[in-house]
């Protein structure tokens, strides 16, 4: 996990999230996403 400080005085937390592709489709393997401020963006 990474934490970034900004001049505005608030912090944004990054967290890598890993999902299994087969849970949402027919593919195998892992899907890696990034959660920023509580929202998965990738």
């Amino acid at each position: 996990d990474a934490e970034f400080r900004h001049d505005s005085g608030y912090e944004v937390h990054h967290q890598k999230l890993v999902f299994f592709a087969e849970d949402v489709g027919s593919n195998k393997g892992a899907i890696i996403g990034l959660m920023v401020g509580g929202v998965v963006i990738a």
């Epitope: 967290q15 999230l17 890993v18 999902f19 299994f20 087969e22 849970d23 195998k28 892992a30």
Partner: nanobody
């Protein structure tokens, strides 16, 4: 819901191997992704590895890649963690946990059922 019991821990020498087992009872085993986590004294719980309900997908923490292998036998309702080339820094309590599908598998907050854990101690 599912219940989990771990076994296979113990005291080994550095470089040795262990195979941990996580046996489930209760609900349909294949409905759950299973993860292994470890917690060393005074440290936070860490993700080790996870496997999908079918066994077709796996994911490993960087520290486990190349040394640990997660697998499952759905006929026996059991998930295994084969641990090779063990190091003293692998010493920890290892616990398995079950997560509903579609949740992130590398974070402990996704897991709502936990086993009691099994102690692994690696001496130098």
């Amino acid at each position: 819901e599912v219940q989990l019991v771990e076994s296979g821990g113990g005291l080994v020498q550095a470089g040795d191997s262990l195979r941990l087992s996580c046996t489930a009872s209760g609900r349909t085993f294949t409905d759950y992704n299973i993860g292994w986590f470890c917690q060393a004294p005074g440290k936070e719980r860490e993700f080790v590895a996870a496997i999908s309900g079918s066994g077709g997908s796996t994911y490993y923490a960087d520290s486990a890649k190349g040394r640990f292998t997660i697998s499952r036998d759905n006929a026996k309702n059991t998930v295994y963690l084969q641990m090779n080339s063990l190091k003293p820094e692998d010493t920890a309590v290892y616990a398995c946990a079950a997560a509903q599908r579609r949740l992130a598998v590398n974070v402990d907050t996704s897991y709502n059922v936990w086993g009691q854990g099994t102690q692994v101690t690696v001496s130098s």
